[in-house]
């Protein structure tokens, strides 16, 4: 058999069979399940005078490990004295030791109930700036609880001072009070609130709800793509209303610029989505020297079913710039598919996020519909990358086996883009 | 809507200290991390210093530490970089920003101020 840490159970009796007057007691300490053999067996009686004696191992016929019962033998002030079991096991490991600390007897006891309560939204349904977390511990027989509050099951620095505790009738209640921030709150972790009492752990989690549908009306509007700024230098913003309820009222989208100048002539969509529910999109131009030069623009939605107007705007992002790094390759030929390749693109630390991926073959940019591109996502400090795939035929790449993958970015140079070719058969 | 003003850059011998202010708005100041970045010019984008929600825990770039000095005023929605012993490496373009995630070190920041520049020069 391999090598087992035991396990170690106080042995108690229950406090209402022993005789008040009685001047000694026994108590003991099972160590089970382990092996090899030996187990070392020592007590921590503190200001009291104890003998000890412990039992020959026995072997558990089904594992064919040990276990083996040390008896503690106090006399004196015993009732108020918590006692210490040490259990080592060297075999295990030179420190290996699990220490039970117990009281002589165990009284019948009414265990508690712990239940979570969390504060409420705001007036608006919005989750104020903190969360109060209260963790109610409640009819237990009175005797000293510990309360532990954890954050994904890590134990969280709390000021535990502020717990109060009542005692109606025979029972007591004891609440403590958590506070978190909104951040934290939201950032889906679990919270618990753990009590420990007669040796025993009861607990009660909670976090964020998900959100529940229907939701409401939503507005966003989005900057212009990089393509369109640099490339094709007639950028567009679009806003773009979501989840609207078919009905008689008009959606009103209006345009409007931080400086007060006029804004140009924007287009208008509606779509019905197969929820039935309504989507607009409006869509202006702006001018390219004018959004360069950090103009805001804003989108305001109102319609009669809305209690207040949705204000939505959009400028440069600011913050600091990083050009793309474009790295592009071919994929080998794959088993059972000779007259497709898969081409792609890994374009990495620019910042900020926005930029356009196009690729291009005899000197013609493909159809964005040819290539997958995914959307920008952050790295740790050294801003975002997106991956860009395209599939070739074989008809593609015998006509000329050059594939060119460029990103468009505000700050690459010159004029704003970056390439890399590629091809499908290098050095043929 | 998320808003960052910085303010304090300008221009100051090497060995001088200088104190940048951000002046925070449109979210909830006391529930976010907040970061300082630079970026000196020609150079990639640099993270300066983080500090966490309360202000207990802060983290220093290694060619910062010791020298700067990152707080907050929750009640006022103010975040401060105290900068001391400067050297000429230390020009830059200075940002404070601030992410939905938690975002203590170097990280990709989704809300940038417009920055405040430093220049240090004899």
């Known amino acids: 058999a391999s090598t087992q840490s035991p396990s170690v159970f106080p042995l108690t009796r229950c406090c209402k069979n022993i005789p008040s007057n009685a001047t000694s007691v026994t108590l003991g300490c099972l160590a089970t399940g382990y092996f090899p053999e030996p187990v070392m067996v020592t007590w921590d009686t503190g200001s009291l005078n104890g003998t000890t004696m412990t039992l020959p191992a026995t072997t558990l016929t089904l594992s064919g490990h040990y276990a083996t019962i040390s008896l503690l033998t106090v006399s004196g002030a015993w009732a108020k004295q918590m006692f210490t079991c040490r259990v080592a096991h060297t075999p295990s490991s030179t420190d290996w030791v699990d220490n039970k600390t117990f009281s002589v007897c165990s009284r019948d006891f009414t265990p508690p109930t712990v239940k979570i309560l969390q504060s409420s939204c705001d007036g608006g349904g919005h989750f104020p700036p903190t969360i109060q977390l209260l963790c109610l511990v409640s009819g237990y027989t009175p005797g000293t609880i510990n309360i532990t509050w954890l954050e994904d099951g890590q134990v969280m620095d709390v000021d535990l001072s502020t717990a109060s505790t009542t005692q109606e009738g025979e029972l007591a209640s004891t609440q403590s009070e958590l506070t978190l921030s909104q951040k934290h709150w939201l950032s889906d972790r679990t919270y618990t609130c753990q009590v420990t009492y007669q040796g025993h752990t009861f607990e009660d989690s909670t976090k964020k709800c998900a959100d529940s549908n229907p939701r409401g009306v939503s507005a966003y509007l989005s900057r212009p793509s990089p393509f369109d700024l640099f490339i094709r230098k007639s950028p567009t913003i679009t806003c773009l209303v979501v989840d609207l309820a078919p009905s008689k009222g008009t959606v009103n989208l209006t345009w409007s610029r931080a400086s007060g100048k006029p804004v140009n002539h924007s287009t208008r969509k509606e779509e019905k989505q197969r929820n039935g529910t309504l989507t607009v999109t409006s869509t202006l131009p702006v001018g390219t020297r004018d959004w360069i030069e950090g103009e805001t623009y804003q989108c305001r939605v109102t319609h009669p079913h809305l209690p207040r107007a949705l204000m939505r705007s959009t400028t440069k992002t600011s913050g600091p710039r990083a050009a793309p790094e474009v790295y592009a390759f071919a994929t080998p030929e794959w088993p059972g598919s000779r007259d497709k390749r898969t081409l792609a693109c890994l374009i990495q630390n620019f910042m900020p996020e926005d930029i356009s991926v196009q690729w291009l073959h005899n000197e013609v940019q493909l159809p964005d519909a040819r290539h997958s591109t995914t959307q920008p996502r952050k790295t740790k400090g050294s801003g975002f990358f997106v991956f860009s795939r395209l599939e070739v035929t074989r008809a593609e790449w015998e006509q000329k086996d050059e594939f060119i993958c460029r990103a468009v970015h505000e700050a690459a140079s010159p004029s704003q883009t970056v390439q890399r070719a590629v091809s499908v058969n290098p050095g043929k | 809507e998320v808003q960052l003003v910085e303010s304090g850059g300008g221009l100051v011998q090497p060995g001088g200290p200088l104190r940048l202010s951000c002046a925070a708005s449109?979210?909830?100041?006391?529930?976010?991390?907040m970061s300082w970045v630079r970026q000196a010019p020609g150079k990639g984008p640099e993270w300066v210093s983080s500090?966490?929600?309360?202000?207990?825990?802060?983290h220093y770039a290694d060619s910062v530490k010791g020298r700067f000095t990152i707080s907050r005023d929750n009640a006022n929605n103010m975040l401060y970089l105290q900068m001391n012993s400067l050297k000429p490496e230390d020009t830059a373009v200075y940002w404070c920003?601030?992410?939905?995630?938690?975002?203590?070190?170097?990280?990709?920041?989704?809300?940038y101020g417009q920055g405040t520049q430093v220049t240090v020069s004899s």
């Open positions: 920003a601030t992410d939905e995630d938690y975002a203590l070190g170097p990280n990709e920041y989704d809300y």
């Open positions: 449109g979210f909830t100041f006391g529930s976010y991390d």
């Open positions: 500090i966490d929600t309360g202000g207990d825990i802060t």
